[in-house]
Interface confidence: medium
């Protein structure tokens, strides 16, 4: 029951991550304009991953994407490419962990299948999580770089007349969202992998077989034991056979005619 | 080889007129948002107006609201400022300014041109 509802838990959170990056990477406030000792406040500017936009006082709003590959920073199109991976990442493992889902009966799917799901798709939430994180970290480190450079800047070269439209650019509400949603995505995927590891329990059952002569003598040969892990051929306790050899649940204390030397 | 070129300014008496131009080369204008910024003799530098790359988001300093009219003409790479009723507290020097509506661009600055209103 435990197990089911950290699945459960695990997927609901991964899947609320998922829809917050894909949110955070679609987002045009990545960077807004730092509107702290700016005298042209009639106007506000902020950009996103595909996009920049300017908000006049009154609401209006005028957005251009950007046309170019070739004119943009390695960094954004680093950041893109992490976001849009993140996104493919958590799109796959939602859809693996919806058939892992314990909940959920697939023919005749067995627990170690769906465990291994669950541990695929569990990963997946993670490195996924990890892109997100990654993303949006990079993007504030140029903004916080950025940002800096524009205040040095501020007060040098025009005579001054920088500091009067000099436009600086902070933190957007993508980054925490993006942030969040990572995070998030992560702690899905961590509950995912917890969750395999109940699904698949470490089973170590010890027997000890038996070897019947053909005659009336009963000889026992040591070193059959077997180990049976939940992940192994042998996870449903099935009947070993080693030549003429008998699990101890089905050993018989006289000779049949099955019985092989 | 970025430029900015102003002209237009000189010599105008009280409540008359000028239209002033800057001439954009060397970068995609459209992308860029203009500004005119004025400085006056022993004086800091005063914001002007600004309007955005596509032209739609335009804005005033309450100082000159309702006398200027900033405009933009992308296909010749130009943007104007259309100054009337001028008034002694407009002298100045008008420089124009380009800014990148993104933050990893450059800004860019014309050399300005002289407005002088007196009678």
């Known amino acids: 029951m435990a197990v089911t509802a950290c699945q459960g838990l695990g997927f609901v959170v991964s899947l609320i991550g998922i829809a917050g990056i894909i949110a955070a990477t679609c987002m045009d406030q990545w960077s807004t304009q730092d509107l702290y000792n700016n005298p042209v406040t009639a106007v506000f500017n902020y950009q996103g991953l595909w996009r920049s936009c300017v908000r006049e006082s009154s609401g209006f709003t005028e957005c251009r994407g950007y046309f170019t590959l070739l004119g943009l920073p390695a960094m954004l199109q680093a950041v893109r490419a992490l976001m849009i991976v993140g996104i493919v990442l958590g799109a796959i493992g939602l859809l693996v962990s919806i058939f892992a889902l314990k909940c959920i009966r697939i023919g005749s799917m067995e627990d170690s299948a769906k465990a291994n799901m669950t541990l695929t798709s569990g990963i997946m939430f993670i490195v996924s999580g990890l892109c997100a994180i990654a993303g949006v970290s990079v993007f504030a480190n140029m903004l916080v770089t950025n940002f800096w450079m524009s205040t040095a800047n501020m007060y040098t070269g025009m005579g001054g007349m920088v500091q009067t439209v000099q436009t600086r650019y902070t933190f957007g509400a993508a980054l925490f969202v993006g942030w969040v949603a990572g995070g998030l995505t992560l702690i899905g995927g961590v509950m995912m992998c917890i969750a395999c590891r109940g699904l698949a329990p470490e089973e170590t059952n010890y027997k000890a077989v038996s070897y019947h002569a053909s005659g009336h003598s009963v000889a026992y040969k040591p070193g059959g034991f077997k180990a049976s892990t939940g992940f192994g051929s042998n996870t449903k306790n099935k009947k070993i056979y080693d030549g003429g050899a008998r699990t101890e649940d089905e050993v018989q204390s006289y000779p049949s005619k099955h019985d092989y030397v | 080889q970025v430029q900015l070129v102003e002209s237009g300014g000189g010599l105008v008496q009280p409540g008359g007129s000028l239209r002033l131009s800057c001439a954009a080369s060397?970068?995609?204008?459209?992308?860029?948002?203009m500004y005119w910024v004025r400085q006056a003799p022993g004086k800091g530098p005063e914001w002007v107006s600004v309007?955005?790359?596509?032209?739609?988001?335009?804005s005033y300093a309450d100082s000159v609201k309702g006398r200027f009219t900033i405009s933009r003409d992308n296909a010749k790479n130009t943007m104007y400022l259309q100054m009337n009723s001028l008034k002694p507290e407009d002298t100045a020097v008008y420089y124009c300014?380009?800014?990148?509506?993104?933050?990893?661009?450059?800004?860019?600055w014309g050399q300005g041109t002289q407005v002088t209103v007196s009678s």
């Open positions: 060397g970068f995609t204008f459209s992308n860029y948002a």
């Open positions: 309007i955005s790359g596509g032209g739609g988001v335009i």
């Open positions: 300014n380009a800014q990148s509506a993104v933050w990893w661009e450059n800004d860019y």
